[in-house]
C-alpha cells in the first residue's frame, strides 16, 4: 500500500510564536508505520 505521508511536506502547522509541531510526522514515525508501511493501525487517510 502506498504511504499517504510525505516527508517533503511534514508538519501540520507553523505559526510564528507557536511551538513547532509535526503531527503528520508523528504518524510517519509511529510504531505502527515502522512495523509495516500500511495498515496497523494508521491506514491511509480516506
Amino acid at each position: 500500500l502506498a504511504d499517504p505521508l510525505d516527508h517533503r511536506d511534514a508538519g501540520d502547522l507553523w505559526v510564528p510564536g507557536e511551538s513547532e509541531s509535526f503531527e503528520d510526522a508523528h504518524v510517519e514515525h509511529s510504531i505502527s508505520r515502522s512495523l509495516l508501511e500500511g495498515e496497523i493501525p494508521f491506514p491511509p487517510t480516506s
Epitope: D12, L13, E23, V27, S32
Partner: antibody
C-alpha cells in the same frame, strides 16, 4: 508482538530524583518518535515529553510543568527510552506511560510524598 | 495552550443503543494538507489508553466500525453506533498539532 515495558517507579520524597525506563521490543525502534505521558490520580492525561529520532538529531520537547526538571533520552542500541526526573514534587505523583501515541505501555506508578 | 473540553463528562447507555461524545478545542486543529489533528482514545478499567480514531475520522486498525469520528476545525464528535459491554471505560480526545500536546478531561461511559 509490540511491547513497551516501563520500570523504575517507586515512592520517593519531594526533591529527590528517579529514572524511569521503557524497554521496547517487537518493532523497528530507531525511526520511531517516542513520548512520555502521565496520568494523575484524578485520571487526567498529561503529555510531558517527546523525543524524535537520530535523523532529527534526537530533538526533545517538554511540557512546561516538567521543563528543566525532567529529561527524556533514548538508546537505540537497547531500543529503550528513559525519563530522568529530578526535583520531584508531590504534583508529579502519577502513572507514567511511554507511548508512540499508537501503542502504549502498561504504565508505572510514581508517588512523591514525604 | 490548546484546551480540549469534553461533554458530557459521564454518560450511561443501554447496550445496543448509540452514544455520542463531544470534544471542543479553543484553537483550530486544522493543519496543512487539510489534516485535522484530533485523536480519540479509550481507556478501559485498569488498562492503558488505546487508540480508536486518528486525524478526526480515521479508524485505527482493529477498532470496530461501530466507532466513528467527525467534526470541523474546533468541534468534534465520537459516535458509537451500537454500544457493547466492552465499550465501557473513559474516552479521551487529544491533539498532537501544537506543543504542548493536550488531552481532554475524559468522558466516562457506563452501561444502564
Amino acid at each position: 508482538e509490540v511491547q513497551l515495558v516501563e520500570t523504575g517507579g517507586s515512592l520517593v520524597q519531594p526533591g529527590k530524583s528517579l529514572k524511569l525506563t521503557c524497554a521496547t521490543s517487537g518493532f523497528p525502534f530507531s525511526n520511531v518518535w517516542m513520548h512520555w505521558v502521565r496520568q494523575s490520580p484524578e485520571k487526567q492525561l498529561e503529555w510531558i515529553a517527546h523525543i524524535k529520532a537520530k535523523s532529527d538529531n534526537y530533538a526533545t520537547y517538554y511540557a512546561e510543568s516538567v521543563k528543566g526538571r525532567f529529561t527524556i533520552s533514548r538508546d537505540d542500541s537497547k531500543t529503550t527510552i528513559y525519563l530522568q526526573m529530578n526535583s520531584l514534587k508531590e504534583a508529579d505523583t502519577a502513572i507514567y506511560y511511554c507511548t508512540g501515541l499508537d501503542y502504549w505501555g502498561q504504565g508505572v506508578m510514581v508517588t512523591v510524598s514525604s | 495552550d490548546t484546551v480540549l473540553t469534553q461533554a458530557p463528562l459521564s454518560v450511561s447507555v443501554t447496550p445496543g443503543e448509540s452514544a455520542s461524545i463531544s470534544c471542543r478545542s479553543n484553537k483550530s486543529l486544522l493543519g496543512i494538507r487539510d489534516i485535522t489533528s484530533l485523536y480519540w482514545y479509550l481507556q478501559k478499567p485498569g488498562k492503558s489508553p488505546q487508540l480508536l480514531i486518528y486525524r478526526m475520522s480515521n479508524l485505527a486498525s482493529g477498532v470496530p466500525d461501530r466507532f466513528s469520528g467527525s467534526g470541523s476545525e474546533t468541534d468534534f464528535t465520537l459516535k458509537i453506533s451500537e454500544v457493547e459491554t466492552e465499550d465501557v471505560g473513559v474516552y479521551y480526545c487529544a491533539q498532537f498539532l501544537r506543543y504542548p500536546y493536550t488531552f481532554g478531561p475524559g468522558t466516562k461511559l457506563e452501561l444502564k
